[in-house]
Interface confidence: low
């Protein structure tokens, strides 16, 4: 696991405990909450980050509105179950024995049930739509400059392969970033779009997960792009299963 050797920290995840106890005295970092070893050369999975967040002092969180056409993470924080690879387990339960099925980004995709609820597989979220509203500026941003800057951000900061940024749409003041990644497209070592979206969401909220890299300073041709609202929509490879009651 790559970590900064000089002071033994994890550049990509500050919610870790690191010590030089790896092979040959190498720096090894473990996620808070789960104690799982993490690869500090890439993003940590959202599941392990949520688990770490739940082990730390609780922060308030704004809930977002659900969408008609996609899943929105409007259930708030929970302490997730992660598998040995750090992915969400398909079935999640809380401390009062309420269970639900989640997708690969940990967002609920079924009605809540009890412990007899069965979740046969972890359904992949293959399309993420990040909907941003920026603060007023002197004029609209140039669309191609904005597009290039956001693609650069996802490539350099979040290590997401450019082919997974499907599109950047802009109608002032709304920016939409479309991330697409099918199971068949994701190769070993590729950052997951769900993890990239989560790091981006935390950056936008001023809660950067990166160690000592400062917050997100997003500029388009020198002009600061300040986001005042974020909504993230998640579309799964298999449609979610909610009762009609929830849809009305």
């Amino acid at each position: 696991h790559t970590a900064a050797q000089d002071n033994c920290t994890c550049p990509t995840n500050k919610m870790t405990v690191c010590s030089p106890d790896g092979p040959g005295g190498r720096c090894q970092c473990r996620a808070l909450g789960s104690g799982m070893a993490v690869d500090c050369s890439t993003l940590t999975s959202k599941c392990l980050l949520l688990k770490a967040r739940m082990s730390a002092p609780k922060n308030a969180r704004t809930l977002v509105r659900p969408s008609e056409h996609a899943l929105v993470d409007n259930d708030g924080l929970y302490d997730p179950d992660c598998d040995p690879e750090g992915r969400f387990k398909a079935r999640q339960c809380n401390q009062t024995s309420v269970c639900w099925c989640v997708n690969s980004v940990g967002v609920r995709r079924t009605d809540k049930g009890d412990l007899s609820l069965r979740c046969d597989e972890l359904v992949r979220t293959h399309h993420i739509l990040i909907d941003l509203r920026h603060r007023p500026t002197a004029g609209a941003f140039n669309h191609s400059d904005l597009d290039a800057e956001l693609r650069r951000l996802f490539r350099e900061r979040y290590r997401l392969h450019p082919k997974f940024v499907a599109a950047v749409h802009y109608e002032q003041p709304t920016i939409q970033i479309e991330l697409r990644q099918n199971t068949s497209q994701k190769a070993a070592g590729d950052v997951d779009i769900g993890d990239a979206a989560y790091y981006f969401e935390r950056d936008i909220k001023g809660e950067s997960l990166f160690q000592g890299r400062g917050g997100l300073d997003l500029r388009v041709r020198g002009e600061p792009l300040q986001v005042e609202r974020t909504l993230i929509y998640y579309l799964d490879e298999i449609p979610p299963k909610f009762s009609m009651k929830r849809l009305t």
């Epitope: 302490d79 997730p80 179950d81 598998d83 387990k89 398909a90 079935r91 999640q92 339960c93 809380n94 401390q95 009062t96 024995s97 309420v98 412990l115 007899s116 609820l117 069965r118 046969d120």
Partner: antibody, heavy 121, light 107 residues
């Protein structure tokens, strides 16, 4: 230390009811589920049901529905199993066992010592 | 209901032997399998939960593995106190179900 202490052995006639108690100590009663498992002489383990001590809601195995009642008294940290319309094949050792609930799932980390219920005419 | 089928049903071995007991679920139970040890006249004791997690205080000679439908309990070097009946249990979905047991006897 964490302990589950069950009531003593019972001898019952067919058609009667039996109520077995399980007193918990050493942990906060409402932070774990209480499961009930039975074992007929020389046989394996059979799950009967459980109670969510946090909400007070029980859940029963299909084979026992209508004959079994699981309850809990949080003031005394005691769980109860009542089985009615007893038959000779209900002769078994009845165990209470603590389980996690929620994301801890249902494995049984602490067991009572067992209560032998004998059904005989 | 999910059936848990253990094999073998009985096993004779000697102190120091490496022993493997298998458990097959009739459908996918992820890694939600526990293993218990039971001695005559006593309550079962938890050894392994979630397929591979050793319970507190359980000796390291006991290990568990598997996921999906196939699970294994291994005792790396049998000790005299290990002769007992072993049960697997799926803790994935209700009704919770156990294997029929494997009786481990001294050869």
């Amino acid at each position: 230390q964490v302990q589950l202490v069950q009531s003593g052995a019972e001898v019952k006639k067919p058609g009667a009811s039996v109520k077995v108690s399980c007193k918990a100590s050493g942990y906060t009663f409402t932070t774990a589920g209480m499961q009930w498992v039975r074992q007929a002489p020389g046989q394996g383990l059979e799950w009967m049901g459980w109670i969510n001590t946090h909400s007070g809601v029980p859940k029963y195995a299909e084979d026992f529905k209508g004959r079994v009642t699981i309850s809990a008294d949080t003031s005394t940290s005691t769980a109860y199993l009542q089985l009615s319309s007893l038959k000779s094949e209900d002769t078994a050792v009845y165990y209470c066992a603590r389980s996690g609930f929620g994301s801890h799932y249902w494995y049984f980390d602490v067991w009572g010592q067992g209560t032998l219920v004998t059904v005989s005419s | 209901d999910i059936q848990m089928t253990q094999s073998p049903s009985s096993l004779s071995a000697s102190v120091g032997d490496r022993v493997t007991i298998t458990c097959k679920a009739s459908q996918d139970v992820s890694t939600a399998v526990a293993w218990y040890q039971q001695k005559p006249g006593k309550a079962p004791k938890l050894l392994i939960y979630s397929a591979s997690h050793r319970y507190t205080g359980v000796p390291s000679r006991f290990s568990g593995s598997g996921s999906g439908t196939d699970f294994t309990l291994t005792i790396s070097s049998l000790q005299p106190e290990d002769f007992a009946v072993y049960y697997c249990q799926q803790h994935y979905i209700t009704p919770l179900t156990f294997g029929q047991g494997t009786k481990l006897e001294i050869k």
